[in-house]
């Protein structure tokens, strides 16, 4: 007569994180008396998942009623699966014994693989702003996915980037994985409205990739161009001199007028106008009382933009 066999019909089971895994097991006999136990892993370090005889296993339910006479179905369901549950599960028949039950026969094992979605990609740029023509690095990170296979792409304004490096960790077997990618982007003066996008595609996303974005407005600094011009005389002894501050970003800007090197007035850009490319223009003027000067006057428009060293433009005012 054949002795009891423990049958685990499924070599592997694939379950999405958060769902319930069903691990199937049947015995061919009710002999010997003793419980079925489920373990994850083999050997002395194996983890007890369920014991028919005793214990409390809140995540585990049996598929059939084990108190029913003649029941030989020892399949279990494990709820709320996470990547940490991945592994090989063994259905093991024990024989009633004193002082402890004795392992009698084990099933061949069922490998539980957990499909876990990657977290939303987080894109981060450089800590400090950079100016056009400079190359800056952006990083993209996503975590907690399984299996390991994943695709990451970079885009700038819809155009795919090619200068990037990607790593998936760890290299060996793990319950879940992380991806880290660094892309290099060359800034242009038109990038205030630009976006850098990191796109992650994974089997769990069913063809709908996750995206993380970074706005280059947080990375770029476009320094202003200055132009100082003298307007026609407004009154008998007053001259209006304007300083045109053009194409700058961000808005944070302070302007100082100097008359022959002496500070005349300082102001902060407030009512700026915005260009189509996202940069700003601003104009400041200075009324100079010509009669107060016997000699020619050197007028300087000095601009400090976004905490950077000041740039200036001068204009010589002739006193006739």
């Amino acid at each position: 007569e054949e002795e009891l066999q423990v049958i685990q019909p499924d070599k592997s089971v694939l379950v999405a994180a958060g769902e319930t895994a069903t691990l199937r097991c049947t015995a061919t006999s009710l002999i010997p008396v003793g419980p079925i136990q489920w373990f994850r892993g083999a050997g002395p370090g194996r983890e007890l998942i369920y014991n028919q005889k005793e214990g409390h296993f809140p995540r585990v339910t049996t598929v059939s009623d084990l108190t029913k006479r003649n029941n030989m179905d020892f399949s279990i369901r494990i709820g709320n699966i996470t990547p940490a549950d991945a592994g090989t599960y063994y259905c093991v028949k024990f024989r009633k014994g004193s002082p402890d039950d004795v392992e009698f026969k084990s099933g061949a094992g069922t490998e539980l693989s957990v499909r876990a979605k990657p977290s939303a990609p987080v894109v981060s740029g450089p800590a400090a702003r950079a100016t056009p023509q400079h190359t800056v690095s952006f990083t993209c990170e996503s975590h907690g996915f399984s299996p390991r296979d994943i695709t990451l792409k970079w885009f700038k304004n819809g155009n795919e980037l090619s200068d990037f490096q990607t790593n998936v960790d760890p290299v060996g077997e793990s319950v879940s994985y992380s991806i880290h990618s660094t892309a290099k982007v060359v800034l242009t003066r038109e990038d205030v409205h630009s976006q850098v996008i990191c796109e992650v595609a994974h089997v769990t996303l069913q063809g709908d990739p996750l995206r993380g974005t970074a706005n280059l407005s947080e990375t770029i600094r476009v320094p202003p161009t200055l132009e100082v011009t003298q307007q026609p005389v407004r009154a008998e002894n007053q001259v209006n001199v304007t300083c045109q501050v053009r194409k700058f970003y961000p808005q944070r800007l302070q302007l100082t007028w100097l008359e022959n090197g002496n500070v005349s007035r300082t102001e902060t850009a407030s009512t700026v106008t915005e260009n189509k490319d996202g940069t700003y223009n601003w104009m400041s003027w200075l009324l100079v009382n010509v009669s107060a000067h016997r000699d020619d006057v050197k007028l300087t428009c000095q601009v400090e933009h976004d905490g950077q060293p000041a740039v200036s433009k001068s204009h010589d005012l002739k006193v006739s």
Partner: antibody, heavy 115, light 111 residues
Framework: RQLVESGGGLVQPGGSLRLSCTAS????????ISWVRQAPGKGLEYIGT?????ITYFASWAKGRFTGSKTSSTAYMELSSLRSEDTAVYFC????????????WGQGTLVTVSS | DIVMTQSPSSLSASVGDRVTITCQAS????????LAWYQQKPGQAPKLLIY???TLATGVPSRFSGSGSGTDFTLTISSLQPEDFATYYC???????????FGQGTKVEIK
Amino acid sequence: RQLVESGGGLVQPGGSLRLSCTASGFSLSSHGISWVRQAPGKGLEYIGTIGTGVITYFASWAKGRFTGSKTSSTAYMELSSLRSEDTAVYFCARGSAWNDPFDPWGQGTLVTVSS
Amino acid sequence: DIVMTQSPSSLSASVGDRVTITCQASQSVYGNNDLAWYQQKPGQAPKLLIYLASTLATGVPSRFSGSGSGTDFTLTISSLQPEDFATYYCLGGGDDEADNTFGQGTKVEIK
């Protein structure tokens, strides 16, 4: 679905007897068959369980004198070195206890040990 | 070996009465629930009523119930019927597979 015992009768002290337990309507292959006896006017006494091969066990008082075997349809129990105190009705039942309790039972067969 | 002590050894009751029989094990039964109750009528084989301490066997009326864990167990008949007059046995299993012992029985008689 029933069990029928046979093989009981009168046997002299020191003698042997082979009891049979035959299943009809179901197979014994995935179940143990347990034997229980009841001396006249007394309570029930567990003897042992016949499983497969190595999975056959008897109460400590029955070891050595009682042995058993089983096919898919019939279980056997061999009684040897019989004594007068072994006089009893011998029942067989399907099951090995715990989550496989004794059910159904045979009608019993009387073994009388007397000279 | 495990020893099962049943009480009372006999009782007299009327139809409709609630009857309680107890069974005490000398040590915790296997899995704290290896306890079955059987009913036997004169000249008949025993019949399974309850197993795993509290699981009602198929076809057994719901007036029979079992409770308990470890060493102390109870069989309750909520409303005694004429066909319930019989002898009741508990069967407890110890940790060894051959360690199965019946209680001495409780005879339920008509008052």
